[in-house]
Interface confidence: low
């Protein structure tokens, strides 16, 4: 209309798809009787009736919109359900009354593309290749508007390079309006990126602000010749029997050559091909003292049909033989004595120490171990160590179970533990004995045993924190045949005032969870970026 | 070697505009991210703005969204700090520097002084 | 925006003293196992520089009486033997969010 002043810039809504678009109708009482409103849609210039409202009441107009509008706000918002991106378009109201005005909305959609998924050239890249290969595909599938590729090498990104990197970018637009886009890179590439980790990177906006996602990281198979073959021992050092023991071949080409590994036998001195994996990796698991020997390794190329065969390797497998103690198992009366004797062989000089399983001190120094007027607290684990002081980690150990006759033991007489009323306690009830007891409980819950050692048995029960509980609390009955004993844990209710129990009372063993906290672990490497500048 | 070398700075009135430039040299500009420090006469540093040269993806300091504008000009090795409604407290030392993706700044220019006064 | 409160804001030293720093955010800036802490030197009239990252790293041409440490909210910086050349101004900044945001320096003076 000549005159008229220029409009003014549409107010900006944001929303994802599927969601529900509010369009208010920003007319002031000065513009408009929001009573009296009609609402338009623009799409490329064309301006299609969409709502009327009369004297507050809304009516949709036939069409794509129909089904999906309803008035709020007593009349001043649109409502616009399951937004598509279909519906990015200027939204208009238009007071009639006093006189005509509009208000414009731009209605902005966006959606989140499904997490990239990165799809390696499988062929491989040979490195004397004259210009860029396929690396790898990156297809990012219903996003809106286009999301942004960025691709990565070892984590720094890639950017188009004459003759070295090309970037190929796609988009196609789905029925639904989504584009999904698809990204090709291609590259040229050295030795060196044999081993180079490369990922595509999605980003995009949504209403809260910039986001992206990473594909997983991939390596591209690249090939080069072979020059040099050679074996390697895994691991390091000093191999002790009992190790896992990896003797492989490896090449500086790829693809590699085919690869037999090679042990010289002791008595004929002939070299005995092994038996290796299907990777070619001749696996020691556990190592024994047999497998020491002369090892070399040959590489054929079967293209060329030449032979390369690397340096001999010795390797000596340390071992200490099985630990023996004697008596295996005893069990003896309160007051008896006991000799304890460890026994074994190694190709080294052995040293031998007693420890107490549970404390871990050191009892003795030497093969035996000499225990006198036992008392029914000596009962438990004694381990004999065997070792070889110059090769740390080579050893054996034996552990043996002295048991003492008696009743059962409990970890603890009474004690006191507190709860707050409808939490579910988490109870717990040691009790050592020979023979090993059982543990009952005088009150319903879910129980379970767990065995700590063959005298030793730990029972731990799941129950509801109630009234009768508080007043009767809860006993836990250790039992064998030659006896019984109760612990009794004492429950008292703690209020949000009070502060930890004093040093002289304990919750000892017994844990209690007032509501469970479930946290699902997220493995999405979506992130949340900062709000970029507004879209313009 | 690496560097950078901030320009542009003066004096200027308020309300009025200023543009810096930061100029950079032995190393590939669009692998690293560019970010504009200020620091004020006997003040602290407080981080403006970042770019990614190889992208022209921007991040903002959320107290200069609107008045302040990053950008660059690969060809140039350069990147710009558009600076619009200017005021007083904008007086200060304006600083470029690189980083990589963990955001520690490894170079930094010399600094261009930016004094807003009528 | 992660807070970063320096201490102490200054400080007097000798040459030869052991100096420590300390940087604390208002909320943690350690993500799986990296710690996002800087520290940076700064001399009047020049421009910062990085002396250590991401928490412990000692940046390349510093020297190795500079190290750092800490992790979630509580950091330091730590000069073992002070030299004549390190009476400057410290910063540390944090690059867990956006904005990155430095402490309020603390100004390491001679005795």
């Known amino acids: 209309v000549p005159g008229e002043a220029e409009q003014p810039a549409p107010e900006l809504v944001e929303v994802e798809v599927g969601s529900t678009a509010l369009l208010k109708c920003g007319l002031s009482q000065s513009q408009g009787n929001l009573s009296h409103v009609d609402w338009f849609s623009v799409h490329k210039e064309k301006r299609t009736l969409i709502f009327r409202v009369r004297q507050g009441q809304g009516q949709s107009e036939p069409g794509e919109y129909e089904q999906r509008l309803s008035l709020q706000d007593r009349g001043a918002t649109l409502a616009l359900t399951q937004v598509t991106p279909q519906d990015e378009r200027i939204f208009l109201c238009q007071g009639k009354r006093p006189r005509s005005q509009e208000y414009r909305i731009q209605l902005r959609v966006y959606k989140a593309p499904e997490e990239p998924n990165i799809q390696v050239n499988p062929l491989g890249i040979p490195v004397n290749s004259k210009e860029p290969e396929e690396v790898a595909t990156c297809v990012g599938r219903n996003g809106y508007p286009i999301p942004q590729v960025i691709w990565y090498k070892n984590g720094r990104p890639l950017k188009e390079e004459k003759n070295r990197v090309h970037i190929q970018s796609s988009q196609t637009v789905e029925s639904s309006g989504l584009y999904t886009l698809q990204s090709i890179l291609k590259a040229q590439l050295v030795k060196e990126d044999k081993d180079a980790q490369f990922y595509c990177e999605l980003n995009y906006r949504l209403p809260s602000g910039n986001h992206m996602k990473e594909s997983r990281e991939v390596t591209v198979p690249v090939f080069y010749p072979t020059e040099k073959v050679w074996l390697e021992v895994e691991p390091v050092g000093m191999l002790k029997e009992g190790d896992r023991v990896e003797i492989r071949c490896l090449a500086d080409g790829n693809p590699p050559p085919h690869f037999s590994i090679s042990k010289q036998n002791p008595s004929t001195r002939e070299a005995e091909e092994e038996t290796t994996n299907d990777n070619g990796v001749l696996v020691l698991e556990p190592a024994r003292k047999e497998h020491s020997g002369r090892y070399e390794c040959q590489g054929l190329d079967l293209d060329t049909m030449i032979s390369l065969l690397s340096e001999p390797q010795e390797l000596l497998v340390n071992y200490v033989s099985d630990v023996r103690v004697s008596p295996a198992a005893p069990e003896r009366q309160e007051g008896s004595s006991l000799t304890l004797t460890c026994e074994a062989e190694s190709s080294q000089d052995l040293e031998f120490q007693w420890l107490r399983e549970e404390t871990g001190q050191v009892l003795e120094r030497g093969p035996v171990l000499q225990l006198h007027d036992l008392k029914r607290e000596a009962g438990g684990g004694y381990r004999c160590v065997a070792s070889v002081p110059s090769i740390p980690g080579l050893n054996r150990t034996q552990l043996v179970n002295v048991a003492i006759f008696g009743p059962p033991w409990m970890a603890f007489k009474e004690r006191k533990v507190w709860v707050k009323e409808n939490m579910v306690l988490n109870l717990s009830c040691e009790a050592s004995g020979h023979p090993r007891p059982t543990i009952s409980w005088n009150v319903n819950g879910t129980a379970s045993e767990q065995d700590q050692d063959p005298q030793r048995v730990l029972s731990t029960l799941n129950v509801l924190v109630t009234p009768e509980l508080l007043e009767t609390g809860v006993e836990c009955t250790a039992s064998n045949d030659l006896g019984k004993n109760t612990s009794i844990l004492f429950l008292e209710l703690v209020n949000l005032t009070t502060l930890t129990p004093d040093s002289n009372t304990t919750t000892g063993l017994s844990t209690s969870t007032a509501s469970p906290h479930t946290r699902a672990n997220s493995t999405s490497t979506e992130r949340k970026l900062p709000e970029p500048e507004s879209r313009g | 070697q690496v560097q950078l070398v901030e320009s542009g700075g003066g004096v200027v009135q308020p309300g009025r505009s200023l543009r810096l430039s930061c100029a950079a040299s032995?190393?590939?500009?669009?692998?690293?991210?560019i970010h504009w420090v200020r620091q004020a006469p006997g003040k602290g540093l407080e981080w403006v703005a970042r770019i990614y040269p190889g992208t022209d993806i921007t991040y903002y300091n959320e107290k200069f969204k609107g008045r302040f504008t990053i950008s660059r000009d690969n060809s140039k090795n350069t990147l710009y700090l558009q600076m619009n409604s200017l005021r007083a407290e904008d007086t200060a030392v304006y600083y470029c520097a690189r980083s990589g993706g963990y955001w520690y700044f490894d170079v930094w220019g010399a600094g261009t002084m930016v004094t807003v006064s009528s | 925006e992660i807070q970063m409160t320096q201490s102490p804001s200054s400080l007097s030293a000798s040459v030869g003293d052991r100096v420590t720093i300390t940087c604390r955010a208002s909320?943690?800036?350690?993500?799986?196992?990296?710690?996002?802490m800087h520290w940076y030197q700064q001399k009047p009239g020049k421009a910062p520089k990085l002396l250590i990252y991401?928490?412990?790293n000692l940046e390349s041409g510093v020297p190795s009486r500079f190290s750092g440490s800490g992790s979630g909210t509580d950091f330091t910086l730590t000069i073992s033997s002070l030299q004549p050349e390190d009476f400057a101004t410290y910063y540390c900044?944090?690059?867990?969010?956006?904005?990155?945001?430095f402490g309020q320096g603390t100004k390491l003076e001679i005795k």
């Open positions: 032995g190393f590939t500009f669009s692998n690293y991210w």
């Open positions: 909320k943690s800036v350690s993500i799986s196992g990296y710690s996002y």
């Open positions: 991401l928490a412990s």
């Open positions: 900044q944090h690059s867990r969010e956006l904005p990155y945001t």
